[in-house]
Interface confidence: medium
Amino acid sequence: LPAQVAFTPYAPEPGSTCRLREYYDQTAQMCCSKCSPGQHAKVFCTKTSDTVCDSCEDSTYTQLWNWVPECLSCGSRCSSDQVETQACTREQNRICTCRPGWYCALSKQEGCRLCAPLRKCRPGFGVARPGTETSDVVCKPCAPGTFSNTTSSTDICRPHQICNVVAIPGNASMDAVCTSTSPTRSMAPGAVHLPQPVSTRSQHTQPTPEPSTAPSTSFLLPMGPSPPAEGSTGD
């Protein structure tokens, strides 16, 4: 079938509506053409002439089919804690998202208005809920038998190593230290085990299921741009 020809402007019959990419002009009382993305209405339609469209100027845009008299201004340049993930063009607004290690504390329709650094859990606390693009990290105290010796926004509480003979018992912020006798956990024979550097752990490691003695979830700290809470640092 041939393409359907749009004879705009035309009057819509009562009960009907203007077609896709057309709008009803109240003054002309006609169905008139919309302007394509990247354009705006320079001259509105009349009973005998259709809409005249013009391209958006630099730093302005229209994302949808429209009949606006002026294009929208692109948002201001991205701040230092943001990354420009979509440039300003005639057809789309600039989109700024938070750089790694930050989350969006105040979002807007597209992108982020205000970024904040992800909370870091201090030693003795691990990540209960990881940060996302729009939510902060939630820290929790390490349960008995687990520890975290780092200040990190990604590290979870890890289980203490199990020693045949304990030299120094572990606590919430330090791993157990074994005597020269090999610990149950696999390691080089005769060596005193020290915890591995946290950086080698995957950010996506799931929190270890906790024993029945673990504190209740009432210990979970609030999400969102709250002031540093116990177990977290402000830096």
Epitope: V5, F7, P9, Y10, A11, P12, E13, P14, S16
Partner: antibody, heavy 120, light 111 residues
């Protein structure tokens, strides 16, 4: 298959009443405006009435205004035309028709028609 | 008398091109309302032939075309065939009547 089937026509005396029905099938009835169009023997087409999909708005030809009522029951996929105070000049084949889409409103599906004869 | 005026008859020989006119006024075609064309073969219900001035529903051959200018519209049939012998009606909305109006119809004869 999209279909419209009219019924209810027949012989009626002047001043009498008749109710025409149009059973729709094969499409989402409530989404379409519907019309009644009539054709007197040997004459051209004459628009009678239109009703939008929801039933909220109706229009009538001057020749039937105040005597005919168009209505629809979307739960039964049926269009109606209640005809009162019938006159000899109302004698015609009555067609129900569906309007295409929401835009141009051409009548793209027609029933086979039902004959209404008003005579004493 | 119909609000939209059509010639009562038109004729042509097979293969010929025939045009049927439909003249309205400032309250219907001239007001910007689109024109629809219907074909009624003898003894059958009407069929939508052209809608929105120039658009063909699926199944309608491209021998049929419609156009509109000012207060009138026209239907053109090229490569005329014997099966095109029928009555043709134009229709549009009319503001002053607040209703849909049909032309009086044109009987097309293929000689």
């Amino acid at each position: 298959e999209v279909q419209l089937l009219e019924s209810g026509g027949g012989l009626v005396q002047p001043g009498g009443s008749l109710r025409l029905s149009c059973a729709a099938s094969g499409f989402t009835f409530s989404s379409y405006a519907m019309s009644w169009v009539r054709q007197a023997p040997g004459k051209g087409l004459e628009w009678v009435s239109t009703i939008i999909g929801s039933g909220a708005n109706t229009w009538y030809a001057d020749s039937v205004k105040g005597r005919f009522t168009i209505s629809r029951d979307n739960s039964k996929n049926t269009l109606y035309l209640q005809m009162n105070s019938l006159r000899a000049e109302d004698t015609a084949v009555y067609y129900c028709a569906r309007h295409e889409g929401y835009y141009y409103y051409g009548m793209d599906v027609w029933g086979q028609g039902t004959l209404v004869t008003v005579s004493s | 008398q119909s609000v939209l005026t059509q010639p009562p008859s038109a004729s042509g020989t097979p293969g010929q091109r025939v045009t049927i006119s439909c003249t309205g006024s400032s309250s219907n075609i001239g007001a910007g309302y689109v024109v629809h064309w219907y074909q009624q073969l003898p003894g059958t219900a009407p069929k939508l032939l052209i809608y929105g001035n120039s658009n063909r529903p699926s199944g309608v051959p491209d021998r049929f075309s419609g156009s509109k200018s000012g207060t009138s519209a026209s239907l053109a049939i090229s490569g005329l065939r014997s099966e095109d012998e029928a009555d043709y009606y134009c229709a549009a909305w009319d503001d002053s009547l607040n209703g849909r109006v049909f032309g009086g119809g044109t009987k097309l004869t293929v000689l």
